[in-house]
């Protein structure tokens, strides 16, 4: 989950973006994106 | 350098299976995502399939999903697309791609061709 | 739905500029979107990832003729100083993930034609 305190440090970027980068990380460390 | 070369494609009747090949060197394999994707002849391009570094997670479009089954063989190098029950809309150039950490599709093959047909 | 759309082709001279539009359905507009490069016989290359702000990572030996720029759902590409290796098809693309789901759609693709 996308915790409030990265939201406001990435703010003015897309949700979609900040998902895009999880994403990506998680399928180099394979941790869980529940 | 990052090398993908895909192998494994050929004809087909409509029905049958069909396992592609991406043999990877240039990089450590087993520290990155690997996507297939596919382009008809004269068309666009189709994401078919992604699986995590260690394989634990897959992802499809609903076009493949429940035919189509990407694995990978990290002690190998390689990545696989097993693909069933064939159709002629198969029919296409197949890629394979490596991540980075920054986008999905950064490295590509120079493909192979499956053409479904009886 | 997320959708990508292009115009199917586009024609500049050698040595001019020529600028690509990529447009993102209306609802995700504010969506980072990727350009692809495939020259004729070719596999695709990776240009650039593309944000809502203008914001670009270009690939590796990617030279810097190519840049990219944003202006609410439309995403552009600019290829400056035409040369002709840089007559190929160009695809936008994105990707999504939704209740653990991935799904990546690409656009149909702009014939980029160079002329003289």
């Known amino acids: 989950a996308v915790s409030e305190h990265q939201l406001l440090h990435d703010k003015g970027k897309s949700i979609q973006d900040l998902r895009r980068r999880f994403f990506l990380h998680h399928l180099i460390a394979e941790i869980h994106t529940a | 350098q990052v090398q993908l070369v895909e192998s494994g494609g050929g004809v087909v009747q409509p029905g049958r299976s069909l396992r592609l090949s991406c043999a990877a060197s240039g990089f450590t394999f087993s520290s990155y995502g690997m996507s297939w994707v596919r382009q008809a002849p004269g068309k666009g391009l189709e994401w078919v399939a992604t699986i995590s570094s260690g394989g634990s997670y897959t992802y499809y479009p609903d076009s493949v999903k429940g035919r189509f089954t990407i694995s990978r063989d990290n002690s190998k190098n390689t990545l696989y697309l097993q693909m069933n029950s064939l159709r002629a809309e198969d029919t296409a150039v197949y890629y394979c791609?490596?991540?980075?950490?920054?986008?999905?599709?950064?490295?590509w093959g120079q493909g192979t061709l499956v053409t479904v047909s009886s | 739905q997320l959708v990508l759309t292009q115009s199917p082709s586009a024609s500049a001279s050698l040595g001019a500029s020529v600028k690509l539009t990529c447009t993102l359905s209306?609802?995700?507009?504010?969506?980072?979107i990727e350009w692809y490069q495939q020259q004729p016989e070719k596999g695709p290359k990776y240009l650039m990832d593309?944000?809502?702000?203008?914001?670009?990572s270009t690939g590796d030996g990617i030279p810097d003729r190519f840049s990219g720029s944003s202006s609410g759902a439309e995403r552009y590409l600019t290829i400056s100083s035409l040369q002709s290796e840089d007559e190929a098809d160009y695809y936008c693309g994105v990707g999504d993930t939704i209740k653990e789901q991935f799904v990546y759609v690409f656009g149909g693709g702009t014939k980029l034609t160079v002329l003289g």
């Open positions: 209306s609802q995700h507009s504010t969506y980072t």
């Open positions: 791609a490596r991540q980075t950490t920054m986008t999905y599709f950064a490295y």
């Open positions: 593309l944000k809502q702000d203008g914001s670009h």
